[in-house]
């Protein structure tokens, strides 16, 4: 059973992941972003199911494509290089999903835009945080 301190750590990491993903979404959605139309042409794989921490494997596998799209944006809204931003997210994701079990990610048939992709994972974080006690 998870201890109080491990739950608190998980909550904290999920909150940081949530803030980082929302930061990216806000940055690319910014009305001053001239590259948004181009960015929306890139397709991202969505998880068939995302209800547990192990499903973060699906996010991890899409972080490289995410970094490539953010490189295109070159947005000043991030205050960090995309490489550093994605590196921070990767560290959190690895800690959250753990490395004890290998999970094969199943993807949905339909791909998504970067905005839909980020919104999906933001909702995932919100949902998991809301179940922590």
């Amino acid at each position: 059973a998870p201890t109080s301190s491990s739950t608190k750590k998980t909550q904290l990491q999920l909150e940081h992941l949530l803030l980082d993903l929302q930061m990216i979404l806000n940055g690319i959605n910014n009305y001053k972003n001239p590259k948004l139309t181009r960015m929306l042409t890139f397709k991202f794989y969505m998880p068939k199911k995302a209800t547990e921490l192990k499903h973060l494997q699906c996010l991890e596998e899409e972080l490289k494509p995410l970094e490539e799209v953010l490189n295109l944006a070159q947005s000043k809204n991030f205050h960090l290089r995309p490489r550093d931003l994605i590196s921070n997210i990767n560290v959190i994701v690895l800690e959250l999903k753990g490395s004890e079990t290998t999970f094969m990610c199943e993807y949905a048939d339909e791909t998504a835009t970067i905005v839909e992709f980020l919104n999906r994972w933001i909702t995932f974080c919100q949902s998991i945080i809301s179940t922590l006690t």
Partner: antibody, heavy 115, light 107 residues
Framework: QVQLVQSGAEVKKPGASVKVSCKAS????????MHWVRQAPGQGLEWMGW????????NYAQKFQGRVTMTRDTSISTAYMELSRLRSDDTAVYYC????????WGQGTLVTVSS | AIQLTQSPSSLSASVGDRVTITCQAS??????LNWYRQKPGKAPDLLVY???NLETGVPSRFSGSGSGTDFTFTISSLQPEDVGTYYC?????????FGGGTKVEIK
């Protein structure tokens, strides 16, 4: 015990800048994001943005974009919030607060903008 | 931005009374809502996090409930030291937003 201690009150002229500090103790500074919240006299609370002390990454509320800069010095466990091009309606108490649930707050720093 | 509508904006009650404050979000925020009390001249204090979890050290007369868009904060038996302004705050979406506050006074 966790403590967030802020710098003292400031009086500034319109158009000037102010830099408020928030020194953290009693926990691992780089393990928690730091938020800044302000409160104008007799008004409610307004979120300004956050900084990740580990990476230096920041995110600002759109209202403050271009005027606010949040930085940190991990060697002294201190976060900073600088607000530029001050106007009279920036007169407020500025608070630092720890992470998304704002479980710990600084005591507040009164910034008065007056000509 | 998510708007939080808090009511009432002020109330006056007697010691021992049950006091209820509501907070309505403009969109679904799961249970990602926190409650704070701010005493005059002081920083806010966290009382309840994630809608219903009592912060360590906070008296059990305080409680919170709700999820989605409708939330309630209750003081089961009002005490003199409970005077102050109470705020709800959502932590689901950026920008983080606060309710307008409820000023609680003793009759």
């Amino acid at each position: 015990q966790v403590q967030l201690v802020q710098s003292g009150a400031e009086v500034k002229k319109p158009g000037a800048s102010v830099k408020v500090s928030c020194k953290a103790s009693g926990y691992t500074f780089t393990g928690y994001y730091m938020h800044w919240v302000r409160q104008a006299p007799g008004q409610g609370l307004e979120w300004m943005g956050w900084i990740n002390p580990n990476s230096g990454g920041t995110n600002y509320a759109q209202k403050f974009q271009g005027r606010v800069t949040m930085t940190r010095d991990t060697s002294i466990s201190t976060a900073y919030m600088e607000l530029s091009r001050l106007r009279s309606d920036d007169t407020a108490v500025y608070y630092c607060a720890r992470d998304l649930t704002f479980d710990y707050w600084g005591q507040g720093t009164l910034v008065t903008v007056s000509s | 931005a998510i708007q939080l509508t808090q009511s009432p904006s002020s109330l006056s009650a007697s010691v021992g009374d049950r006091v209820t404050i509501t907070c309505q979000a403009s969109q679904d925020i799961f249970n990602l809502l926190n409650w704070y009390r701010q005493k005059p001249g002081k920083a806010p204090d966290l009382l309840v996090y994630r809608a219903s979890n009592l912060e360590t050290g906070v008296p059990s007369r305080f409680s919170g409930s709700g999820s989605g868009t409708d939330f309630t904060f209750t003081i089961s038996s009002l005490q003199p030291e409970d005077v102050g302004t109470y705020y709800c705050q959502q932590s689901a979406n950026l920008p983080l937003t606060f309710g307008g506050g409820t000023k609680v006074e003793i009759k």
